[in-house]
Interface confidence: low
């Protein structure tokens, strides 16, 4: 069938269109093109005779048409009037006629649009704005863009006039944006330049900064005011209702208590005509004096005296604060505060109460601190210590003993031998001692301020013969693979060699054995059950030697994995079942049995007479060592066969 295709269908003014013929018949005489939907001689555009290849213009020929041998028609420099239908009339050689009609539409190239507005300075929450996209163009579609986005859905936005007009009702400051319109038709699309909507708003309620309202006398007051506004607000300051100045900032140097009052910032928008104010109340406080501490007892005696510390000066309606060692007061029954917190009482002072103590006066602005105060607590003397710790000396050496006792003020020392006063010194020195220097050596410490005295007595033995040593231990029952044990050979003697034996042998080389303290101490790390041996220490000097009695180490261990005997697991029905459980353990463990998970009895031996197949199952022995806190277990399966069915063993 003969058809006409328009390429393109929508044609821009000034461009060209091709009316393309499809299914053109064979053996043609010629063809003609007509404007319109039918053959009308008055509207013939062009005719073509194939035999002569002659094209003849018709009444509707405009000079812009070109006909091709394949019957297609090209129209150039398209104008608006070219829109419509075109008919091709084909005359075949047998003079039979055929017709086909095609069409196209002509659209203008759109100009760049622009936006007109009915209100260039709308007021927030009051005015509406209507934007119109110019020019008005037939067969054009109008689109709108806000900040290069399509229009948001909003009841305040309304399109009218075929979308050519965009109306914003009750504008807000958030409508301040870039607006563009776009025109479209089938052959072109153009977008306008941006129009920025300038919404007048504010002023909002101003904010005054900084936020603080309390100041000290002598400081500078510097207040700044800001209110959201378009155009920017004009500012005025009022103090206690009296106009001060028309500035955004208010600065008053070196303020006094008289500058306390209400400070008002007024913001004014000259375009909207609106005013808004904010008031802040400023309080200026006088500078308080620096506090100091007085004490009712500058030299209190430990465990006897109380001390009352008072924060000066006394000021009405003031909060007093206390600190000890830069910390707030600890909770203690020995610390008492007066009702107004001005007096801190320390009941029964100790040497640890020296301080430092600080008091503070809290005012509306800050805390003012006193200088720290330190208490001179009188204490001691504590029990004196005599060094060195040796108690055995050989004749001919020098004896030099020193005494020390904690005390404030420092203690005065005296030495007595067998109750007889010797000298008033901290150190006692006797050269070239003999057996006659053996005896009771007493150090007496005296505190002259408190009047207290304390003594310590030490027995000194001067002998060529060493005493029989003994072994002390820091752990009498160590646990295997867990504890360490330190043996110490007593006494500590001067110029003495210390020796050790284990089971009568000298010490084996082992990373778990360590000698220290001049070989006087033997440490066993990570003890094992094999360390349960006899330990002996010996002492010797150039004239004598002696050994201690043996000390046997009692190592707690286990329980190890238990063993159930006999090892048999198959029995004949009717036999007696007699199972015995054993686990290596010190002390001996506690035993218990479970059959198929059910607890049975707390014995080492489990006996069941005349067993049957019902006694089949798992037999578990549990062992526990209360001393080591460790547990262990083993499970054995027992099978009981009916008599004669399998070779069994009878218990």
């Amino acid at each position: 069938k003969l058809t006409i295709e328009s390429t393109p269908f929508n044609v821009a003014e000034g461009k060209e269109v091709l009316l393309l013929v499809h299914n053109l018949p064979q053996h043609l005489f010629g063809y003609s093109w007509y404007k319109g939907e039918r053959v009308d001689g008055n509207r013939q555009i062009i005719g073509y005779v194939i035999g002569t290849q002659q094209a003849t213009p018709g009444p509707a020929y405009s000079g812009r048409e070109i006909i091709y041998p394949n019957a297609s028609l090209l129209i150039q420099n398209i104008i608006q009037n070219d829109t419509g239908f075109y008919t091709l009339h084909v005359i075949k050689s047998d003079l039979v006629n055929e017709e086909a009609t095609g069409q196209f539409r002509v659209y203008p190239e759109l100009p760049k649009p622009s936006i007109s507005s009915n209100n260039s300075k709308p007021v927030e929450d009051k005015d509406a704005v209507a934007f119109t996209c110019e020019p008005e163009t037939q067969d054009a579609t109008y689109l709108w863009w806000v900040n290069n986005q399509s229009l948001p859905v909003s009841p305040r936005l309304q399109l009218s006039n075929g979308n050519r007009t965009l109306t914003l009702f009750n504008v807000t400051r958030n409508d301040t944006a870039s607006y563009k319109c776009e025109t479209q038709n089938p052959v072109s699309a153009r977008r306008s330049d941006s129009v920025i909507l300038n919404v007048l708003y504010g002023p909002d309620a101003p904010t005054i900064s900084p936020l603080n309202t309390s100041y000290r006398s002598g400081e500078n007051l510097n207040l700044s005011c800001h209110a959201a506004s378009n155009p920017p607000a004009q500012y005025s300051w009022f103090v206690n209702g009296t106009f001060q100045q028309s500035t955004q900032e208010l600065f008053i140097p070196n303020i006094t208590v008289n500058n306390s009052g209400s400070y008002t910032c007024q913001a004014h928008n000259s375009d909207t005509g609106l005013n808004r104010t904010t008031v802040t109340t400023i309080t200026v406080y006088a500078e308080p004096p620096k506090p100091f501490i007085t004490s009712n007892n500058s030299n209190p005696v430990e465990d006897e005296d109380a001390v009352a510390l008072t924060c000066e000066p006394e000021i009405q309606n003031t909060t007093y604060l206390w600190w000890v060692n830069n910390q707030s007061l600890p909770v203690s029954p020995r610390l008492q505060l007066s009702n107004d917190n001005r007096t801190l009482t320390l009941l029964s002072v100790t040497r640890n109460d020296v301080g430092p103590y600080e008091c503070g006066i809290q005012n509306e602005l800050s805390v003012d601190h006193s200088d720290p105060v330190i208490l001179n607590v009188l204490y001691g003397p504590d029990d004196p210590t005599i060094s060195p710790s040796y108690t055995y000396y050989r004749p001919g050496v020098n004896l030099s003993l020193s005494c020390h006792a904690a005390s404030n003020p420092p203690a005065q020392y005296s030495w007595l031998i067998d109750g007889n006063i010797q000298q008033h010194t901290q150190e006692l020195f006797i050269s070239n001692i003999t057996e006659k220097n053996s005896g009771l050596y007493t150090c007496q410490a005296n505190n002259s301020a408190s009047g207290h005295s304390r003594t310590t007595v030490k027995t000194i033995t001067v002998s060529a013969e060493l005493p029989k040593p003994s072994i002390s231990s820091n752990n009498s029952k160590p646990v295997e693979d867990k504890d360490a044990v330190a043996f110490t050979c007593e006494p500590e003697a001067q110029n003495t060699t210390y020796l050790w034996w284990v089971n009568g042998q000298s010490l084996p080389v082992s990373p778990r054995l360590q000698l220290s303290n001049g070989n006087r101490t033997l440490t066993l790390f990570n003890v094992t059950r094999n360390d349960a041996r006899a330990y002996v220490c010996g002492i010797q000097n150039s004239v004598s030697a002696n050994r201690s009695d043996p000390v046997t180490l009692d190592v707690l261990y286990g329980p190890d994995t238990p063993i159930i005997s006999p090892p048999d697991s198959s029995y004949l029905s009717g036999a007696n079942l007699n199972l015995s459980c054993h686990s290596a353990s010190n002390p001996s463990p506690q035993y218990s049995w479970r059959i198929n998970g059910i607890p049975q009895q707390h014995t080492q031996v489990l006996f069941i007479a005349k067993i049957t197949p019902n006694n089949n199952g798992t037999y578990a022995c549990f062992v526990s060592n209360l001393a080591t806190g460790r547990n262990n277990s083993i499970v054995k399966s027992i099978t009981v066969s009916a008599s004669g069915t399998s070779p069994g063993l009878s218990a």
């Epitope: 900084p210 603080n212 309202t213 309390s214 100041y215 000290r216 400081e219 500078n220 510097n222 600190w323 830069n326 600080e358 809290q362 509306e364 602005l365 800050s366 805390v367 003012d368 601190h369 200088d371 720290p372």
Partner: nanobody, 117 residues
Amino acid sequence: QVQLVESGGGLVQPGGSLRLSCAASGFTFSSSYMSWVRQAPGKGLEWVSGINTDGSFTRYADSVKGRFTISRDNAKNTLYLQMNSLKSEDTALYYCAVGGGLGYGPWGQGTLVTVSS
């Protein structure tokens, strides 16, 4: 004319450290109780720490105790704030101020501390 100039702020990762300084002039620094205060984005002012005139006594807000250390050098008229183990909630504009506790006197323009990974 009282002048306080803070410095030392910046961007730091959580757990990091910063040391803020405040150079003071125009008043008797050595006889003024000094404080650090801060203002987090969208929040009000928060007192951070205070120090007495000779530096012998310091106080801290619970939120920074054990992490921040305030100190001063009266010879240099300078206040310091050593900030360790910083957290994201420490992000704020930090001001040094004359006074402390419930109110403050003049303060500087602030230094911004941003704690972010």
